[in-house]
């Protein structure tokens, strides 16, 4: 009696089961009574990453440099390419097609984590007793200047965008 | 029942064109390559083209095929073709037709050529 | 194109005996090779795929071995319907598909 299911790593085609092609070939022909699955190996600039019974095999991701795209890891016949974003960019989606610039931590806010070419700079608002005065990807909140270890005084208090001015202690006559 | 019929095959003069068509049955033609092959009376095999499944349809001919035969396939209609132009008397021979590639485990009994003045 | 390269041309044996088939490829073709008996008036039939790959139904006594650009088919007790004509088919798979077959090897009753 024919089949009307098959085991894993298998299709059923005319009432038999065939074998799926293996990561990285393509399928050519189904089984036969005679014969196994005709399966091929996906060309250089091709992959397949599952067992499978497709007829073509994907075409590898193109990193484009024109988006300021870079290769990270080259693909294989069972693996597409992996593409990253070039210094001072980052992906715009999880499937990274484009990239853009980095964001600069404005003033008042520091950068809680640098950016890669997958994630975007992670800016965090700086809190009492730190401050941030230029608008950067890199820079954290810097703390304010500490008057007294100086043998100084505060002159003018610090704010989340200012340093604090130290000024001379008034010396009673 | 799985099996290839062909049809097509005459007598004609060379410089002809001719069509020959294999019908195929009991098996799903969209996911089997096709090929053809020939043999001259009383020779070898030769093999003639072969087109891979599916919509990729790639083509593939031997190099004194190229530009004068063209391999194509109906998948509606499950028939597998080989138009043939420029006809030459050594183009005398039964062409058969096969499902796969690498190899051939389906064969149709074959449909005569004959190229002659 | 790829050349297959079929020997010998014509051998004559007898029923029992073990007989060779060698096919040779012009350039590697890895194991894309495929062995046919035929018998006159009729269509070829697949024997041996992958190189050394049984097609079932077909008798244990064939059988199939090489890669590259070597292979050899062997019939390890020759039988009386047995005696036909024996086809290579070799295919180059790259960035093109080029299949090819040998001059084939005629085996008569010695």
């Known amino acids: 009696e024919p089949p009307t299911a098959c085991r894993e790593k298998q299709y059923l085609i005319n009432s038999q089961c065939c074998s799926l092609c293996q990561p990285g070939q393509k399928l050519v022909s189904d089984c036969t009574e005679f014969t196994e699955t005709e399966c091929l190996p996906c060309s250089e600039s091709e992959f397949l990453d599952t067992w499978n019974r497709e007829t073509r095999c994907h075409q590898h991701k193109y990193c484009d440099p024109n988006l300021g795209l870079q290769v990270q890891q080259k693909g294989t016949s069972e693996t597409d390419t992996i593409c990253t974003c070039e210094e001072g960019l980052h992906c715009t989606s999880e499937s990274c097609e484009s990239c853009v610039p980095h964001r600069s931590c404005l003033p008042g806010f520091g950068v809680k984590q640098i950016a890669t070419g997958v994630s975007d700079t992670i800016c965090e608002p700086c809190p009492v007793g730190f401050f941030s005065n230029v608008s950067s990807a890199f820079e954290k909140c810097r703390p304010w200047t500490s008057c007294e270890t100086k043998d100084l005084v505060v002159q003018q208090a610090g704010t989340n965008k200012t340093d604090v001015v130290c000024g001379p202690q008034d010396r009673q006559r | 029942e799985v099996q290839l019929e062909e049809s097509g095959g005459d007598l004609v003069q060379p410089g002809a064109s001719l069509r020959l068509s294999c019908a195929a049955s009991g098996f799903d033609f969209n996911s089997n390559a096709m090929s053809w092959v020939r043999q001259a009376p009383g020779k070898g095999l030769e093999w003639v083209a072969s087109?891979?499944?599916?919509?990729?349809?790639?083509?593939y001919y031997a190099s004194w095929a190229k530009g004068r035969f063209t391999i194509s396939k109906d998948t509606s209609k499950t028939t597998l073709y080989l138009q043939m132009n420029s006809l030459r008397a050594e183009d005398t021979a039964t062409y058969f037709c096969?499902?796969?590639?690498?190899?051939?485990?389906?064969w149709g009994q074959g449909t005569l050529v004959t190229v002659s003045s | 194109d790829i050349q297959m390269t079929q020997s010998p041309s014509s051998l004559s044996a007898s029923v029992g005996d073990r007989v060779t088939i060698t096919c040779q490829a012009s350039q590697s073709i890895s194991s894309y090779l495929a062995w046919y008996q035929q018998k006159p008036g009729q269509a070829p039939k697949l024997l041996i795929y992958?190189?050394?790959k049984l097609a079932s139904g077909v008798p244990s006594r064939f059988s199939g071995s090489g890669s590259g650009t070597d292979f050899t088919l062997t019939i390890s007790s020759l039988q009386p319907e047995d005696f036909a004509t024996y086809y290579c088919?070799?295919?180059?798979?790259?960035?093109?598909?080029?299949?090819?077959f040998g001059q084939g090897t005629k085996v008569v009753i010695k």
């Open positions: 096969a499902r796969g590639i690498t190899r051939l485990p389906l």
């Open positions: 992958d190189a050394s």
């Open positions: 087109i891979y499944a599916g919509g990729s349809g790639s083509t």
């Open positions: 088919q070799g295919t180059y798979y790259g960035s093109t598909t080029i299949s090819a």
